[in-house]
């Protein structure tokens, strides 16, 4: 494949990362899916720059980011070390609450509406954002 | 690689109290609920108790509620159990757990007089 | 409470036998169920989350398929490895519980 130069159509282009952002709602699962139909991955935040970067764009809405821990250690969707990474939970997350009464805990990480994150059950339909990277090898067959 | 090691466990007459301690590390501890199940000797799982990872949340078997206390020092990586009014159906090997994925080794508590 | 029970209580079963370990919940518990494998002496080990989810790490030869009440775990090719005490657990509420075990020895 070729390598992608320049953001799709309808992507916001940052420090050599495109960006989608949604403004329908979905579950996490199905989020993570939409955006690797799209060659991307939900967003990863590896800095405090790019997290008030997605901040703005999202506003004060809950949405996803590629964050869980479904098998036990929190994990980034594309294999960031979530241990040596960047962290901007709320105070007291994550905490796998259970309370909500819709039946297992919470293991699907979003921003909350002051951005800082927070842990929630995966099934909720929240917006969702998907970032590829730049000069990655695109799946697409370059134009002749 | 993650590392749960569990302490505090030995010979206790009924009645008396022990605090198991389980010393982490390897993660970001206060990212995780910890747990403690349990086995009695020759027999199956029992879980017994968990914690969020900030301590705001904590959940007990009704076989121990009333006698035993889960807590959590996240400043030292350990979670305990303070386990009073101990009784001969108390004995076991206690296993921290991890986000019920990732186990100690265990420690053997004997309730016996 | 969730009551967990399994069967068979044990089996025998040679090397290379496919073997099927039943799991039932006493309620609703959608696919908040995990098997671990457990060796005399040993804790216990993670196979399978959420019903279906293969742990990382644990062979192709393990698979799990369930959902609601009913559930099953599955191994392809018996080898002497697998000869251990299976467990199902519910984490769909607190308290969590574990089915009464399962022992596979050899025939």
């Known amino acids: 494949g070729s390598e992608r130069t320049c953001c799709p159509v309808n992507w916001v282009e940052h420090e050599r990362s495109c960006y989608w952002f949604s403004r329908s709602g979905k579950a996490w699962a199905d989020a993570d899916n939409y955006c690797r139909l799209e060659d991307a991955h939900l967003v990863v935040v590896t800095s405090w720059e790019e997290q008030k970067f997605v901040q703005h764009h999202i506003g004060p809405v809950n949405t996803w980011m590629g964050l869980h821990d479904q098998n036990g250690p929190w994990k980034w969707v594309d294999g960031t070390d979530y241990e040596t990474g960047f962290k901007n939970w709320r105070p007291e997350q994550p905490d796998d609450w259970y309370g909500h009464g819709l039946g297992g805990g919470e293991d699907c990480a979003h921003f909350t509406d002051d951005g800082r994150w927070n842990d929630d059950v995966c099934q909720r339909p929240y917006r969702w954002v998907c970032e590829t990277e730049l000069d990655k090898a695109s799946q697409e067959p370059p134009l002749l | 690689e993650v590392q749960l090691l569990e302490s505090g466990g030995g010979l206790v007459q009924p009645g008396g109290s022990l605090r198991l301690s389980c010393a982490a590390s390897?993660?970001?501890?206060?990212?995780?609920?910890m747990s403690w199940v349990r086995q009695a000797p020759g027999k199956g799982l029992e879980w017994v108790s968990a914690m969020s990872g900030s301590g705001g949340h904590t959940y007990y078997a009704d076989s121990v509620k009333g006698r035993f206390t889960i807590s959590r020092d996240n400043s030292k990586n350990t979670v305990y159990l303070q386990m009073n009014s101990l009784r001969a159906e108390d004995t076991a090997v206690y296993y921290c757990v991890k986000h019920g994925y990732s186990w100690g080794q265990g420690t053997l508590v004997t309730v016996s007089s | 409470d969730i009551q967990m029970t399994q069967s068979p209580s044990s089996l025998s079963a040679s090397v290379g036998d496919r073997v099927t370990i039943t799991c039932r919940a006493s309620?609703?518990?959608?696919?908040?169920l995990a098997w671990f494998q457990q060796k005399p002496g040993k804790a216990p080990t993670s196979l399978i989350y959420a019903s279906s989810s293969l742990q990382s790490g644990v062979p192709s030869k393990f698979s799990g398929s369930g959902s609601g009440t009913d559930f099953t775990l599955t191994i392809s090719s018996l080898q002497p490895e697998d000869f251990a005490t299976y467990y199902c657990?519910?984490?769909?509420?607190?308290?969590?519980?574990f089915g009464p075990g399962t022992k596979v020895d050899i025939r």
């Open positions: 390897g993660f970001t501890f206060s990212s995780y609920v």
């Open positions: 309620q609703d518990i959608n696919n908040y």
């Open positions: 657990q519910q984490y769909h509420s607190y308290p969590f519980t």
